[in-house]
C-alpha cells in the first residue's frame, strides 16, 4: 500500500533570464527512493539515481543544474519554460510517486515568487 505523499513548491513564477529551484519532498513512507526523475511535459530533464548520482539530459546541460538535494535548478529562463514540471520518485517497495509544479516565466521585471519551499 502506498502511504507516501509528495510536497512540492506548487505554482511558482520567475523572471525571464533568471533562475528557479524546483523542489519536491516525499514524506510519510519508509520506502527506499531508488531514483528521482525530473520531467517537463514530454521531456526528461534530469535523473538522480541513488547509486549513480545525477545525470542531466544532454539537451539541457547548459541550463539545468542538479540540486539542492533532490531538487533541480533551472537557469537562464525563457518564456518557453512556462509549463508543468514533474518530480517522479521511483521507490521500493511502494512504486512511483509523482509531484507536479507549475512554473510561469514572466516577461516583466517584477515576478511574484511562490513561498520559499523548505524541506523539514
Amino acid at each position: 500500500m502506498m502511504t507516501g505523499t509528495i510536497e512540492t513548491t506548487g505554482n511558482i513564477s520567475a523572471e525571464k533570464g533568471g533562475s528557479i529551484i524546483l523542489q519536491c519532498h516525499l514524506s510519510s513512507t519508509t520506502a527506499q527512493v531508488t531514483q528521482v526523475n525530473w520531467e517537463q511535459q514530454d521531456q526528461l530533464l534530469a535523473i538522480c539515481n541513488a547509486d549513480l548520482g545525477w545525470h542531466i539530459s544532454p539537451s539541457f546541460k547548459d541550463r539545468v543544474a542538479p540540486g539542492p538535494g533532490l531538487g533541480l535548478t533551472l537557469q537562464s529562463l525563457t518564456v518557453n519554460d512556462t509549463g508543468e514540471y514533474f518530480c517522479i520518485y521511483h521507490t521500493y517497495p511502494d512504486g512511483t510517486y509523482t509531484g507536479r509544479i507549475f512554473l510561469e516565466v514572466l516577461e516583466s521585471s517584477v515576478a511574484e515568487h511562490g513561498a520559499r519551499f523548505q524541506i523539514p
Epitope: 531508488t34 531514483q35 526523475n37 526528461l44 535523473i47 547509486d51 549513480l52 544532454p58 539537451s59 521511483h90
Partner: antibody, heavy 117, light 107 residues
Framework: EVQLVQSGAEVKKPGASVKVSCKAS????????IEWVRQAPGQRLEWMGV????????NYKEKFKGRVTITADKSSSTAYMELSSLRSEDTAVYYC??????????WGQGTTVTVSS | DIVMTQSPDSLAVSLGERATINCKAS??????VAWYQHKPGQSPKLLIY???YRYTGVPDRFSGSGSGTDFTLTISSLQAEDVAVYYC?????????FGGGTKVEIK
C-alpha cells in the same frame, strides 16, 4: 579518440568465474558511466549493470545480483565485470559501453565467453 | 522491469524506400529512449537518444520520434549499408532494458 578495449575471448567450465576487462582512453574516465551489456546467441541485448567510476557506485540488474561484480580502477582507466557460478546460458558476447545519461555512446569490441563442460 | 516491445521482428524494404520500426514501452518512459544499429560481428552503434536527438555523425536519413510509451525509428531512404538489426532501449530507469530487435533487409 574515445576507445574502449576489452580483454580476449574466454572458455570456462560451469561453476567457474570469468573476469572481463574494459580499458578506456580518449576521455575523462570518471566523468562517464561504464555499462555492461551481453548478447547470448539469437537473443536480444541484455543490460547487466553499471558503475560510476568517479564514485564507485554500482547498480545491477536483479537477476545478476550476487553473481556479478563490476569494479573500476581509476589509475588505469579500466573497468571490470566479474560473473561467477557460470552456466551454459551465460555463453554470450559481453560488451562494455560508455554511459552518457544512461544511453551508450561508445562500445567495446565485445568479449566472447563460452561456458562448456 | 520496463518491457520494450519492438515491431516488426523483421522488415524488407527496397533501396531508397522508407523503413519504419516501432517500439512500445510497458510503462511511461517520457522521452527516455535510444536506438542502436547492430551489424553482425560489430559492436552496436548509437543512432538516436532521448527519443528524437540524432547522435553525432549519424546520417540525417535516421530520425526518431515519440514520447510516453510509443516510439518510432524511421530510415527515410534505405541504403545498402543500413542492413542490420535495430534495437530500442529505455534509459528512463534501471534496469535499462532493450527491445527484441528488428532485422532490416533489402527487398
Amino acid at each position: 579518440e574515445v576507445q574502449l578495449v576489452q580483454s580476449g575471448a574466454e572458455v570456462k567450465k560451469p561453476g567457474a568465474s570469468v573476469k572481463v576487462s574494459c580499458k578506456a582512453s580518449g576521455y575523462a574516465f570518471t566523468n562517464y558511466l561504464i555499462e555492461w551489456v551481453r548478447q547470448a546467441p539469437g537473443q536480444r541485448l541484455e543490460w547487466m549493470g553499471v558503475i560510476n567510476p568517479g564514485s564507485g557506485g554500482t547498480n545491477y540488474k536483479e537477476k545478476f545480483k550476487g553473481r556479478v561484480t563490476i569494479t573500476a580502477d581509476k589509475s588505469s582507466s579500466t573497468a571490470y565485470m566479474e560473473l561467477s557460478s557460470l552456466r551454459s546460458e551465460d555463453t554470450a558476447v559481453y560488451y562494455c559501453a560508455r554511459g552518457e545519461y544512461f544511453f551508450f555512446d561508445y562500445w567495446g569490441q565485445g568479449t566472447t565467453v563460452t561456458v562448456s563442460s | 522491469d520496463i518491457v520494450m516491445t519492438q515491431s516488426p521482428d523483421s522488415l524488407a524494404v527496397s533501396l531508397g524506400e522508407r523503413a519504419t520500426i516501432n517500439c512500445k514501452a510497458s510503462q511511461h518512459v517520457s522521452n527516455g529512449v535510444a536506438w542502436y544499429q547492430h551489424k553482425p560481428g560489430q559492436s552496436p552503434k548509437l543512432l538516436i537518444y532521448s527519443a528524437s536527438y540524432r547522435y553525432t555523425g549519424v546520417p540525417d536519413r535516421f530520425s526518431g520520434s515519440g514520447s510516453g510509451t510509443d516510439f518510432t525509428l524511421t530510415i527515410s531512404s534505405l541504403q545498402a549499408e543500413d542492413v542490420a538489426v535495430y534495437y530500442c532501449q529505455q534509459h528512463y530507469n534501471t534496469p535499462h532494458t532493450f527491445g527484441g530487435g528488428t532485422k532490416v533487409e533489402i527487398k
